[in-house]
Interface confidence: low
């Protein structure tokens, strides 16, 4: 290409501005958007070969307009070549305030590490300025419109653009992507590459063999009718500069997941077990949900299996509504769109003892006037094995009178089935309820028993008792 590796002085767009003496040497300064130009010298006529100025601030009407000379316009070159180009301007001496020339690309100022030099050619009429720009080993990202900006007397002047077109091997803007597909189900792959130079032609490759005999113009969509095993696909992009090959992508066939592993019990209570697991390989398809299977371990025969469904994430589930002090076998299975995995290895887990499920029975309350105490008696409730070992009772007694309300409770050990509590208020009603306590917690309170505490020594009580329900312990 004519413009590649060309000397700077051959790149000047049009003749050098003004007439320079034969032995005149320019002086140069590295480019800076803040550089000040040297003071102008003497007046000179304005050259005709100039670009129409693009004014972005109010221009002074008292001075002749200045504008950049026409640029080279369009440079075409191959990747990795060097390119040099310039913009130039003539500033008559009548202009007192001039700032340095700045280079812009695609609307953004080029600051920092760009090789640019500004050369000044002063004479008696003013100064000619040539801003030289070079790019070593151009890349596709150097493609674009370059232009110069300069402020003269607070007026911003913009040069015509120089379009730099870098040609090279095809460049992928869309490569095929790895996908996971259902066995024997059709799917599409897309490949798109661009120049310049155009056109770009695409060949598809499957497991190192070309799929299409004739190339397709980019962009290309390959429809694969279906696969029965994993395959690797890529695409070749061809243009006049040569060939580029995309990354190879694996197309995986979806299968059922592997079973979960590392099933652990994180916490147990009387009626729940918190279980965690590590999902197995997902079979190239996202896990959708998991199933926790629970069966009683103590049953001699194969008891029924309880199934609890949950989302695939988090890998955690609290199994509820279990019996207290019971042993269970637990396993986990997960599914994807293809199907369910095998179950994980079964693990053993136990619930802790529960709280009593029945309240104490036959509660009676008497007032012992002489000692000013209430005598409370009851019958031990029928506590099941899984309710745990009885450790005591809680007695709730509430005292109510005209202006007073007192709610108190006592805990007594399991020895015996009676208790005495001091009278708190006279001329009041006392309501008594009792609950049994095991290591698993506190059970339900009994039905309330009321007794009226007289002001003096008269007693009117209801020694009502709670009826003993049938023993349900089997």
């Amino acid at each position: 290409e004519k413009w590649e590796e060309t000397e700077l002085d051959q790149l000047f767009s049009g003749p050098l501005p003004g007439r320079l003496p034969v032995n005149h040497r320019p002086f140069s300064a590295p480019h800076s958007s803040r550089d000040q130009l040297p003071p102008p010298q003497t007046g000179r006529s304005h050259p005709a070969h100039t670009a129409a100025p693009q004014v972005t601030s109010t221009a002074s009407k008292l001075l002749p307009p200045v504008a950049f000379n026409h640029t080279i316009g369009h440079i075409v070159l191959s990747e990795h070549k060097n390119v040099k180009f310039n913009c130039s301007i003539n500033i008559p001496n009548t202009y007192q305030e001039t700032a340095g020339i700045s280079w812009w690309k695609d609307g953004k100022e080029l600051l920092g590490a760009h090789h640019s030099i500004t050369q000044f050619y002063p004479d008696e009429e003013g100064v000619s300025i040539i801003a030289l720009f070079s790019i070593a080993s151009v890349q596709r990202s150097d493609n674009g419109s370059y232009f110069c900006k300069m402020k003269v007397n607070n007026r911003e002047i913009v040069s015509d653009p120089i379009y730099v077109e870098v040609q090279g091997l095809p460049y992928f803007i869309k490569q095929p992507e790895s996908v996971n597909v259902t066995r024997n189900t059709a799917f599409n792959l897309t490949c798109q590459a661009v120049g310049p130079p155009e056109p770009v032609n695409i060949f598809w490759v499957q497991n190192s063999s070309r799929v299409n005999e004739k190339p397709e113009r980019s962009p290309s969509v390959l429809t694969v009718p279906g696969l029965t095993e994993t395959a690797v696909f890529s695409c070749e992009a061809h243009n006049d500069k040569g060939l580029t090959v995309s990354k190879g992508v694996h197309i995986n066939i979806k299968v059922i997941p592997s079973p979960p592993t590392e099933v652990h019990i994180l916490n147990s209570t009387a009626h729940s077990i918190l279980v965690s697991w590590v999902p197995g390989f997902d079979g190239y398809s996202p896990l959708q949900n998991c199933s926790i299977q629970v069966k009683e371990a103590d049953r001699l025969s194969n008891g029924s299996v309880m199934v609890f469904n949950t989302s695939a994430s988090p890998h955690l589930y609290e199994i509820q509504q279990l019996q207290a002090l019971a042993n269970y076998s637990i396993a986990v299975s997960c599914r994807n769109e293809i199907g369910w995995s095998a179950v994980s290895p079964w693990i053993l887990a136990s619930t802790t003892e529960g709280a009593p499920s029945v309240a104490p029975l036959n509660i009676t309350v008497f007032l012992n006037e002489s000692n000013n105490i209430l005598d409370i008696r009851w019958t031990k409730p029928p506590i099941k094995r899984q309710d745990g070992e009885l450790v005591g009772y809680r007695i709730s007694h509430v005292w109510e009178s005209a202006g007073t309300y007192k709610e108190l409770s006592e805990e007594v050990s399991q020895n015996g089935s009676w208790a005495q509590i001091p009278v708190q208020i006279h001329n009041a009603t006392c309501t008594v309820r009792i609950a049994a306590i095991t290591k698993g917690g506190i059970g339900p309170f009994s039905e309330p028993v009321n007794i009226i505490i007289p002001e003096h020594s008269k007693v009117d009580y209801a020694p009502s008792s709670t009826p003993a329900p049938g023993n349900t312990d089997s």
Epitope: P30, S32, G112, H115, I117
Partner: antibody, heavy 116, light 110 residues
Framework: QSVEESGGRLVTPGTPLTVTCTVS????????MGWVRQAPGKGLEYIGF?????NTYYASWAKGRFTISKTSTTVDLKITSPTTEDTATYFC?????????????WGPGTLVTVSL | DVVMTQTPASVEAAVGGTVTIKCQAS??????LAWYQQKPGQRPKLLIY???NLASGVPSRFAGSGSGTQFTLTISDLECADAATYYC????????????FGGGTEVVVK
């Protein structure tokens, strides 16, 4: 890696003076260089910077009063028309990168005295 | 150009103590701020760059923080050798806004 200034001396007002900074152990095509001065008993004052590709930047007060240029191993600071206010120790310093103007290696400084 | 204002101008602290120096920029400079230490008759030494990054060989007793317009240099476990003048400097878009230094803070160690 080191930098060293030279060329500081007594000059009369209006007489141009160039101070030179010589570098070793690194390339001026990779790193920028800055100039900073310090008047006696005063603080540091940034003058300007030349980046790895030769672009020069100046503090607003220094534009027109100073010119920075470089060769492959030296960086020059020209005081175009010194005044007595330019009496100071002049430091050159290596930038952290091509266009980064923080200075990780400093020279010992060279004293410029401007006096009648 | 950006103007850097440094406070206080002087600070005194005991050995083992902590000193905090503040630097304010006249406009946002991101994190493009450096701190230097200069002892009498010596060249400046880079302590911190990019507001909080410790320069090579600088002890971790020196710490920088801040962004935008407000910056701080903290020197903890003061040593006698820390007696010096400390300067902040912006290098944000140095081509546009300059590389101004703050006025300096003299640290006196008792």
């Amino acid at each position: 890696q080191s930098v060293e200034e030279s060329g500081g001396r007594l000059v009369t007002p209006g007489t141009p003076l160039t101070v030179t900074c010589t570098v070793s152990g690194f390339s001026l095509s990779v790193y920028g260089m800055g100039w900073v001065r310090q008047a006696p008993g005063k603080g540091l004052e940034y003058i300007g910077f030349i980046n790895n590709v030769g672009n020069t930047y100046y503090a607003s007060w220094a534009k027109g009063r100073f010119t920075i240029s470089k060769t492959s191993t030296t960086v020059d600071l020209k005081i175009t028309s010194p005044t007595t206010e330019d009496t100071a120790t002049y430091f050159c310093a290596k930038g952290g990168g091509g266009d980064w103007g923080y200075f990780n290696i400093w020279g010992p400084g060279t004293l410029v005295t401007v006096s009648l | 150009d950006v103007v850097m204002t440094q406070t206080p101008a002087s600070v005194e602290a005991a050995v083992g103590g902590t000193v905090t120096i503040k630097c304010q920029a006249s406009q946002s400079i991101g994190n493009a701020l450096a701190w230097y230490q200069q002892k009498p008759g010596q060249r400046p030494k880079l302590l911190i760059y990019a507001a909080s990054n410790l320069a090579s060989g600088v002890p971790s007793r020196f710490a920088g923080s801040g962004s935008g317009t407000q910056f701080t240099l903290t020197i903890s476990d003061l040593e006698c050798a820390d007696a010096a003048t400390y300067y902040c400097q912006t290098y944000y878009a140095i081509n546009r806004y300059g590389g101004a230094f703050g006025g300096g803070t003299e640290v006196v160690v008792k």
